[in-house]
């Protein structure tokens, strides 16, 4: 999937299995990624996890799933709220659009995440204060933390790379360079730019994660997905100017943040 | 799991997570650190070598080291100590949530808190 | 719930060939190394191999190598034992474990080499 | 190939008392950096094996904590602080410094 970091770092990640997105004293994030084609070394977001950690009078712990084509209101427990804690409308579950949409707030901790099902996968969307995301304590159980340091060197895509080499072309062409080799012949470069530009006009990385995108599946709800991110970057995002990136970020690994 | 890479990895971000990126300057303490790191999943090889979670340390401290110039001998470094406040603490700090009244947005005595965003889409 | 499932035991002449499988659920599975372990009727357990996340490394025991070979299917979530050239020996309850420390086992499947 | 011992092969133990099992490598399992990979796993009648312990004395989430582990180089031990019915089983000590890995031959505890 494309991450964007707490530092606003943009990069395209093959990581496949369960990885831990955000993990402090407060919160937990997990995602499961799965191969959007089988060969390709291009993953999406199939399986989501949140616990939100017990708190003082406001909060008992709670966890949050979604799967694929299971986007549920309620925590595993049924609850929409935070439990029995005389705070406990300080944690909330929203639903949107159902099936689609979904937003957890969590007031007592100044947290907004917003889960989506775009297609057949998952987005996920987080703004939270810093000093949350610096709340950690027990420095072992941090694992490969990807909002805050992003993903490791070697499991990340250089899908402007691949941008560039495609254009003109259809997807086949490029297969040696593409992340997915069943990538299919039905989607040129020109229909998967005109795709995207009708809902992402500004050619940022969000449209170029569209274009990857479509030219790597020849799944348009990628195009939704794009879309929806940087819907809930602007909703999110507390800085206005940067909703808009331009220069992905190839990083180090553990140096994202 | 019987497999502690993650410790390893946690070890290491954590000797390293004084700044956002190592300046030029750093490169001798950054290194210093990549070896620990390096030396924590040799230990942990034995255990862990046929898991993904090992590789990935293993390829992503090779790369490291190259990017950085690192030699593979030399000093190892001790991973900083960390003293935020636990969840759990019942007193109020300038440092923790706001805990005393949870309906409350996260607003301390005024204070706007630095916001942060990171998200997740697509392939 | 860590699950997996052995399946593809049964009775072989020595000789012949047989192909086991193990079914993992509960856990990603193309996170993992995976171990074959065997044991004879009333005796005690004997590692037979192991293979890496990625199927990269495969090791052996002195007594399978060259006879047995381990692979598996990440997009089945699916562990794989070909024994061939089958011995009165190698008759065994085979099991499979999760990790390279096998933290995890199946149930195991009965492979009996008789004529 | 490594050879580990146990010792005894069968060990009659009395509900509520310790009990003790011997695992003896025939090279050292220790690392040049100090660490030791021999692990513990029980076999109970009519089950598959599950792993106790792991290198050398660090219990496996869902152990009690009446099962400890100890030693160094060849000689290591697994204890049981007070046998209870449920502990019936056999007990493998398994080395995975050197390849191949091997078991030892097991020691069976059964309840006098």
């Known amino acids: 999937p494309h991450l964007r970091t707490f530092t606003d770092r943009f990069q395209t990640c093959k990581v496949q299995g369960a990885w831990p997105l955000i993990d402090n004293n407060y919160l937990n994030v997990q995602v499961t990624n799965t191969p959007v084609l089988p060969g390709s070394a291009a993953t999406a977001t199939s399986k989501l996890t949140i616990i939100f950690k017990n708190f003082q009078e406001c909060v008992d712990q709670k966890v949050y799933q979604a799967e694929m084509d299971e986007l549920p209101a309620a925590f595993v427990d049924g609850s929409k709220n935070g439990g029995d804690k005389h705070g406990a409308n300080s944690l909330k579950i929203t639903e949107k659009v159902s099936g689609q949409h979904v937003e957890i707030r969590a007031k007592y901790i100044g947290t907004t995440i917003v889960v989506r099902q775009v297609g057949r996968y998952l987005t996920f969307a987080v703004r939270v204060p810093e000093e949350v995301v610096n709340a950690v304590e027990d420095w072992d159980s941090q694992g490969l933390y990807l909002c805050l340091r992003g993903c490791p060197l070697n499991q990340q895509i250089d899908f402007q790379a691949f941008h560039t080499n495609t254009e003109g072309t259809g997807a086949r062409r490029l297969a040696a360079a593409s992340p997915a080799p069943t990538a299919p012949e039905t989607f040129p470069y020109e229909t998967a730019v005109a795709k995207c530009k009708e809902k992402l006009p500004v050619e940022d990385l969000y449209y170029q994660a569209c274009v990857f995108d479509l030219l790597t599946t020849g799944d348009v709800n990628f195009t939704l997905a794009a879309y929806y991110a940087l819907e809930d970057v602007k909703m999110l995002h507390s800085n206005k100017d940067k909703l808009h990136l331009y220069e992905r970020t190839r990083d180090l690994p553990g140096r994202a943040a | 799991s019987p497999c502690k890479i993650l410790k390893c990895n946690s070890e290491f971000w954590s000797a390293t997570s004084g700044s956002h990126a190592p300046a030029s300057d750093d490169t001798p303490e950054f290194c210093a650190a990549l070896r620990s790191y390096a030396l924590c999943t040799r230990r942990t090889a034995r255990t862990c070598r046929g898991d993904l979670a090992y590789h990935s340390a293993v390829h992503g401290i090779e790369d490291l080291m190259s990017q950085h110039n690192c030699s593979k001998d030399g000093p190892t470094s001790q991973p900083r100590l960390h003293t935020l406040p636990p969840a759990g603490d019942s007193q109020e700090r300038s440092d923790s949530p706001e805990i005393c009244h949870c309906e409350k947005s996260f607003h301390k005595h005024s204070a706007t808190p630095n916001y942060t965003h990171c998200g997740l889409f697509g392939d | 719930e860590v699950q997996l499932v052995e399946s593809g035991g049964g009775l072989v002449q020595p000789g012949g060939s047989l192909r086991l499988s193990c079914a993992a659920s509960g856990f990603t599975f193309s996170n993992y190394g995976m171990n074959w372990v065997r044991q004879a009727p009333g005796k005690g357990l004997e590692w037979i191999g192991m293979?890496?996340?990625?199927?990269?490394?495969?090791h052996y025991a002195d007594s399978v190598k060259g006879r047995f070979t381990i692979s598996r299917d990440n997009s089945k979530n699916t562990l794989y034992l070909q024994m061939n050239s089958l011995r009165a020996e190698d008759t065994a309850v085979y099991y499979c474990?999760?990790?390279?420390?096998?933290?995890?086992w199946g149930q195991g499947t009965m492979v009996t080499v008789s004529s | 190939d490594v050879v580990l011992t146990q010792s005894p092969l069968s060990l009659p133990v009395t509900l509520g008392q310790p009990a003790s099992i011997s695992c003896r490598s025939s090279?050292?399992?220790?690392?040049?950096?100090?660490?030791?990979?021999l692990h513990w796993f029980q076999q109970r009648p009519g089950q598959s094996p599950r792993l106790l312990i792991y290198?050398?004395?660090t219990r496996f989430s869902g152990v009690p904590d009446r099962f400890s582990g100890s030693g160094s180089g060849t000689d290591f031990t697994l204890k049981i602080s007070r046998v209870e019915a449920e502990d019936v089983g056999v007990y493998y000590c398994?080395?995975?410094?050197?390849?191949?890995?091997?078991f030892g031959q097991g020691t069976k505890l059964e309840i006098k």
């Open positions: 474990a999760k990790g390279t420390t096998p933290d995890y």
């Open positions: 090279q050292s399992l220790e690392e040049s950096d100090g660490y030791t990979f």
């Open positions: 398994f080395q995975a410094t050197h390849d191949p890995l091997t």
């Open positions: 293979i890496y996340y990625d199927s990269s490394e495969k």
């Open positions: 290198e050398v004395s």
